[in-house]
């Protein structure tokens, strides 16, 4: 297993609709044809998997149907979007990239993107 550098933004603010997007960029040492991208959430020293996708170079990222993530890839960049976020989902979201093929296997883990989610204020009842 060899190490690989992964870069991602330090901070992202989710939209009022609970959507956060960020770019995960990896320094590929060669021409990988099978790449696995995983988003992990770290909060209170606990790590959980948010979503994961394996893609063949040149093809679209495919997350599971019920995933809260979507994404696109371009070269060594992956554009990730996480939907359905609430204030309680605020935390550090870590991008993990694995170059599965061809050998050797490379693993890269980013420093994480702190995603802040603010629940929108409910609309006041109108008097009309």
């Amino acid at each position: 297993c060899k190490a690989m550098h992964v870069a991602q933004p330090a901070v992202v603010l989710a939209s009022s609709r609970g959507i956060a997007s960020f770019v995960c960029e990896y320094a590929s040492p060669g021409k990988a044809t099978e790449v696995r991208v995983t988003v992990l959430r770290q909060a209170d020293s606990q790590v959980t998997e948010v979503c994961a996708a394996t893609y063949m170079m040149g093809n679209e990222l495919t997350f599971l149907d019920d995933s809260i993530c979507t994404g696109t890839s371009s070269g060594n960049q992956v554009n990730l979007t996480i939907q359905g976020l609430r204030a309680m989902d605020t935390g550090l979201y870590i991008c993990k990239v694995e170059l599965m093929y061809p050998p050797p296997y490379y693993l890269g883990i980013g420093n994480g993107t702190q995603i802040y989610v603010i629940d929108p204020e409910p609309c006041p009842d109108s008097d009309f």
């Epitope: 992990l40 994961a52 394996t54 870590i94 599965m100 296997y105 693993l107």
Partner: nanobody, 119 residues
Framework: EVQLVESGGGLVQPGGSLRLSCAAS????????MGWYRQAPGKQRDLVAS???????NYADSVKGRFTISRDGAKNTVYLQMNSLKPEDTAVYYC?????????????WGQGTQVTVSS
């Protein structure tokens, strides 16, 4: 607990065939590169074949055209079909799973199964 359980080894005559199986826990099987390695007495452990979650395959030159690796997602099992066996294929064959789990690298080994090719 992660477990890799191998089976299928044994004694076979030169030119014969064997099929090795390795059953793995589900999470390991779907996320990791599964491989077969072998170790002959007094030698180092060498890669025989590996298969990625996406189905990409890598073979050692010495087994190309004779050995076939495959994976069955429904059974969480990886297979090594070995044909046209030679005496130099005699070794202990180990199943391996490597990749990562959450933030940690993972590298798991089975207990090994003996393959002896002899007349």
């Amino acid at each position: 607990e992660v477990q890799l359980v191998e089976s299928g080894g044994g004694l076979v005559q030169p030119g014969g065939s064997l099929r090795l199986s390795c059953a793995a826990s589900g999470n390991i099987f779907t996320r990791n590169i599964m491989g077969w390695y072998r170790q002959a007495p007094g030698k180092q452990r060498d890669l025989v074949a590996s298969i990625t979650p996406g189905g990409n395959i890598n073979y050692a030159d010495s087994v190309k055209g004779r050995f076939t690796i495959s994976r069955d997602g429904a059974k969480n099992t990886v297979y090594l079909q070995m044909n046209s066996l030679k005496p130099e294929d005699t070794a202990v064959y180990y199943c391996n799973a490597h990749g990562s789990i959450l933030l940690n690298r993972s590298n798991y080994w089975g207990q090994g199964t003996q393959v002896t090719v002899s007349s």
